[in-house]
């Protein structure tokens, strides 16, 4: 999915509102720097790729991250405010209820979600140089 | 089942302001956002906004923004909007719609309507 | 915005004929379109979702096609309960728009 025509002021105020906060409430407990940050972005339509990578695909160690309530609210922003998006998970949907996987969290969870903060702070900053 | 209960019709003066109220139950009224679609008398649909539980926030098509405010309460499971400054362009049947934001993403369950007659 | 134009405005036929009714999409929307049937001082009810997948407890003769800017309601043997007007809606991007709606009536 192609994430350019996304309206990221929309999907940047619901992450300041309330995503972030789950963000935190997911790390609640662990020290911010615990975790180095090894997943970057370059741009907004770059973030939200990488941000859709790391809460709904699953990876070895860390199957449940989309069951969580920050990866509800990621796929309610971009469904509402990426134009498409919605029809492209409508199958993704039905494969996630047959999955099922358990909520567990794992210290590779806690390192995934530590990335997703680094990547949802770089997508509020677009104007920022890439270090 | 999935029901939508809203308010009944209202008579209001130009200028005043209408506030309606559209009840769900059978569902988790968060999974789902809550749409608004104005009928004028014989004519088409027109879609208002949207209120977004998940995320506590809403949008609206450019042409009622700022007349409109959409807002929800979740301990009630019901969703509200209310219309301003009123004119007789707003005599219409409004239709409160949910639409799935985590799956469904269609507005498969639909209100009864509530009739707004703007007369003097 | 998209402006979701439906031809024809009116449809006359008998029942027991077969129907086509069109959507045209002022831009390409892949297959975020739904068709709704609306009855005389009745809510709309949703038909088919995303251009052709079927809704549960909707009969069989309703169906639809198309992707893009073109889409397609099929209605394979009127029944004389399917006099109503019907829309189709892009849900693509906000705002969301609804067609101009068509008018099936007993010739």
């Known amino acids: 999915y192609d994430f350019t025509n996304c309206d990221f002021e929309k999907i940047k105020a619901a992450y300041l509102s309330t995503i972030s906060k789950d963000l935190i409430t997911y790390m609640s407990g662990t020290k911010s720097t615990e975790f180095n940050n090894t997943v970057s972005c370059s741009n907004r339509p770059h973030c939200l790729t990488e941000i859709q990578s790391l809460t709904f695909n699953p990876t070895a160690g860390c199957a449940s991250l989309a069951k969580e309530m920050f990866a509800m609210k990621t796929k309610a922003a971009l469904a509402i405010w990426c134009p498409g998006y919605s029809e492209t998970q409508i199958n993704a949907t039905q494969a996630m209820k047959k999955r099922r996987a358990a909520k567990v969290t794992t210290n590779k969870c806690l390192e995934q979600v530590s990335q997703l903060q680094g990547l949802w702070r770089r997508f509020n900053r677009p104007l920022l140089k890439q270090q | 089942e999935e029901k939508l209960q809203q308010s009944g019709d209202d008579l209001v003066r130009p200028g005043a302001a209408v506030k309606m109220s559209c009840k769900a139950s059978?569902?988790?009224?968060?999974?789902?956002?809550m749409h608004w679609v104005k009928q004028r008398p014989g004519q088409g649909l027109e879609w208002i906004g949207t209120?977004?539980?998940?995320?506590?926030?809403?949008d609206y098509n450019q042409n009622f923004k700022g007349r409109a405010t959409l807002t929800a309460d979740k301990s009630s499971n019901t969703a509200y909007m209310e219309l301003s400054r009123l004119t007789s362009e707003d005599s219409a049947v409004y239709y409160c719609?949910?639409?799935?934001?985590?799956?469904?993403?269609?507005?498969?369950?639909w209100g009864q309507g509530a009739s707004v007659t703007v007369s003097s | 915005d998209i402006v979701l134009t439906q031809s024809p405005a009116t449809l006359s036929v008998t029942p027991g004929e077969s129907v086509s009714l069109s959507c045209r999409a002022s831009?390409?929307?892949?297959?975020?379109v739904h068709w709704f049937q609306q009855k005389s001082n009745e809510s709309p009810r949703l038909l088919i979702k995303f251009a052709s997948q079927s809704i549960s407890g909707i009969p069989s003769r309703f169906s639809g096609s198309g992707s893009g800017t073109d889409f397609t309601l099929n209605i394979n043997r009127v029944e004389s309960e399917d006099f109503s007007v019907y829309y189709c809606q892009q849900t693509f991007s906000l705002p969301y728009t609804f067609g101009t709606g068509t008018k099936l009536e007993l010739k």
């Open positions: 719609a949910r639409m799935g934001v985590t799956h469904s993403y269609v507005m498969d369950a």
């Open positions: 059978g569902y988790i009224f968060t999974d789902y956002a």
């Open positions: 831009q390409p929307i892949s297959i975020s």
């Open positions: 209120f977004i539980p998940l995320l506590d926030t809403s």
